[in-house]
């Protein structure tokens, strides 16, 4: 469930602190409820960038697990189509710390509406 997703995000945050990754990532910091699935997609795609750049097995496995969890949770809600949402490339670029904080925020939004 989403609680496990948050714990994976915390784990990624801890793992990244011991590394020096300067990447900036497309970050949705003000998610509209009608675009939360689209925003989640962008966060997950950007997480793969972190995984690639880190080259770290623990980060790779945790990112993969997080995507598996999110996929299964969202698939159980059926196909959700959203329109009028920003493309990932239109989002503001932020550092990893801010990116992960915003990610936790959107997950909490899913928790509050489930």
């Amino acid at each position: 469930n989403w609680v496990n997703v948050i714990s994976d995000l915390k784990k990624i945050e801890d793992l990244i602190q011991s590394m020096h990754i300067d990447a900036t990532l497309y970050t949705e910091s003000d998610v509209h409820p009608s675009c939360k699935v689209t925003a989640m997609k962008c966060f997950l795609l950007e997480l793969q960038v972190i995984s690639h750049e880190s080259g770290d097995t623990d980060i790779h496995d945790t990112v993969e697990n997080l995507i598996i969890l999110a996929n299964n949770i969202l698939s159980s809600n059926g196909n959700i189509t959203e329109s009028g949402c920003k493309e990932c490339e239109e989002l503001e670029e932020k550092n990893i710390k801010e990116f992960l904080q915003s990610f936790v925020h959107i997950v909490q939004m899913f928790i509050n509406t489930s």
Partner: antibody, heavy 122, light 112 residues
Framework: EVRLMASGGGLVQPGGSLRLSCAAS????????MSWVRQAPGKGLEWVAT????????YYPDSVKGRFTISRDNSKNTLYLQMNSLRAEDTAVYYC???????????????WGQGTLVTVSS | DVVMTQSPLSLPVTLGQPASISCRSS???????????LEWYQQRPGQSPRLLIY???NRFSGVPDRFSGSGSGTDFTLKISRVEAEDVGVYYC?????????FGQGTKLEIK
Amino acid sequence: EVRLMASGGGLVQPGGSLRLSCAASEFTFSNYAMSWVRQAPGKGLEWVATISRGGDYTYYPDSVKGRFTISRDNSKNTLYLQMNSLRAEDTAVYYCARRVSMITGGWAFDYWGQGTLVTVSS
Amino acid sequence: DVVMTQSPLSLPVTLGQPASISCRSSQSIVDITGNTYLEWYQQRPGQSPRLLIYKVFNRFSGVPDRFSGSGSGTDFTLKISRVEAEDVGVYYCFQDSFVPYTFGQGTKLEIK
């Protein structure tokens, strides 16, 4: 050439246990997630378990969850499947398979071992 | 769980002729990141399965170009442009977009 050698199969009574092993060679074992897939006699394929590269994350279908445990020893390049509370319907050839990572371009079982037969019968 | 349904279950083909196998999923297998994790595996008699196609249409290394994959959403197809004797066996579609990962029942290809 990637090599996967499954072993440990045999005849076991219902309710019994068995541990399968899969020895990997000719690739960097710790760089790949690994899986077990089974095939009952004359039947189709069924996914049984997957384990992440580092071994922290495991995935199972409901049919084996709580009875089977997948694990790995990266220092020995070996994958395991501990099977407890075995049932007649667990009778199958068990294949180990290397799993390509989603993050490196798509998920798939790109290489398979030769399989080991597990027979559960009294 | 996602149910994968293949048709036909038996496919007699004349050597040199084309063959087509259909695979339908009970729900869309497009994942949250927009990827579709649909593979095709071949199992020759007495052998272990072998990867042919991954992510719907990508041929695995060493797979002859007479094999091709297509489809989207819930409907997928494996095509063999000209069947050869070595193509005899059972073909399985497989989805790993969502846990539990699931195979189709298999399609047995035989020579007429």
